[in-house]
């Protein structure tokens, strides 16, 4: 079943290569288990950046080696991507799946264009 997901159109990464945005989805109703996936679209190719499943009892938990962190509150997920470089500029799509109990719902945002500007190297000081 379809579900709406919303995310900001544009986000500028910090000089440290960190970008954060909120992914909000249509009310989870009685969903007890929610899976959030961050996808990066480059041209016609879509790659998974990171994913996490959380339950209404637990906080959002990405794998320890993930480039993402996040917190959840109701039907909002605050996602943070770290370690971004200029080549990481692109469209980042939030996908939300209401996994359990049935029925299954899936929603995809329109994507957030994340702009990453690599910091200029510091000039040598005399």
């Amino acid at each position: 079943k379809g579900m709406h997901a919303a995310q900001p159109a544009v986000v500028l990464a910090s000089s440290r290569g960190v970008a954060s945005f909120v992914c909000e989805y249509g009310s989870s109703g009685n969903a007890a288990e929610v899976r959030v996936t961050m996808l990066r679209q480059a041209g016609s190719q879509m790659t998974e950046v990171c994913a996490a499943t959380y339950t209404v009892e637990d906080e959002l938990a990405f794998l320890d080696d993930s480039t993402c962190t996040g917190t959840s509150s109701g039907n909002k997920v605050n996602l943070t991507i770290q370690g971004l470089r200029a080549m990481g500029t692109g469209l980042y799509i939030c996908k939300v799946e209401l996994m359990y109990p049935p029925p299954y719902y899936v929603g995809m945002g329109n994507g957030t264009q994340i702009y990453v500007i690599d910091p200029e190297p510091c000039p040598d000081s005399d």
Partner: antibody, heavy 116, light 112 residues
């Protein structure tokens, strides 16, 4: 504190009807599915079905389709079980239970006795 | 429907001894998302059931580490490493993977 308080149990004649209540408190009622579980005297637990408290959509186990109806009053945070055309074999303790990915919270149970 | 079969029907264990209860499902209870919603509950006379284990092997908060769950697919086990007097009651497995969700028939644990 999260609580599920049940009421409405009674002695009913065969063919009669009864409505059981389960009042929830201590959490947002519409965030969790609510279930009914039956336990006949000296027997095991039997899952009757559940109702989505957000959409109001019920799901019934086959044995409970027809004579049993789940309903809600979200303004009162209350779940109901309407039972019609009651038979002696419906004599049991009826539990309500809140489900997420498990049942951490149960009502205390309420007893229906069907006898002439 | 998924039939959940528990064995034994009853067991009598001395305090401090281990106990094991088996639960077998008539078909795989792996849900479409890859999770297995298999739980264990303990019911004492005149009381509501209490959650012990969820998703096969996760202990619910406050449950002593004497209790452990294991298994996959269709075969599941609840183990109590050292039985205590407070563990007496009827243990039920439950599957929440395939509607209609179903309970096992129960296993009565008595203390010698």
């Amino acid at each position: 504190e999260i609580q599920l308080v049940q009421s409405g149990g009674d002695l009913v004649k065969p063919g009669g009807s009864l409505r059981l209540s389960c009042k929830a408190s201590g959490y947002t009622f519409t965030n969790y599915g609510m279930n009914w579980v039956r336990q006949a005297p000296g027997k095991g637990l039997q899952w009757m079905g559940w109702i989505n408290t957000y959409t109001g959509e019920p799901t019934y186990a086959d044995d409970f389709k027809g004579r049993f109806t789940f309903s809600l009053d979200n303004a009162k945070n209350t779940l109901y079980l309407q039972m019609n055309s009651l038979r002696a074999e419906d004599t049991a303790v009826y539990f309500c239970a809140r489900r997420s990915i498990y049942y951490p919270y149960w009502g205390q149970g309420t007893t229906l006795t069907v006898s002439s | 429907d998924v039939l959940m079969t528990q064995t034994p029907l009853s067991l009598s264990v001395s305090p401090g001894e281990p106990a094991s209860i088996s639960c077998r499902s008539s078909q795989s209870i792996v849900y479409s998302n890859g999770n297995t919603y298999l739980e264990w509950y303990l019911q004492k006379p005149g009381q509501s059931p209490k959650l012990l284990i969820y998703k096969v092997s996760n202990r619910f908060s406050g449950v002593p580490d004497r209790f452990s769950g294991s298994g996959s697919g269709t075969d599941f086990t609840l183990r109590i490493s050292r039985v205590e007097a407070d563990d007496a009651g009827v243990y039920y497995c439950f599957q929440g993977s395939h509607v209609p969700w179903t309970f096992g028939g129960g296993t009565k644990l008595e203390l010698k």
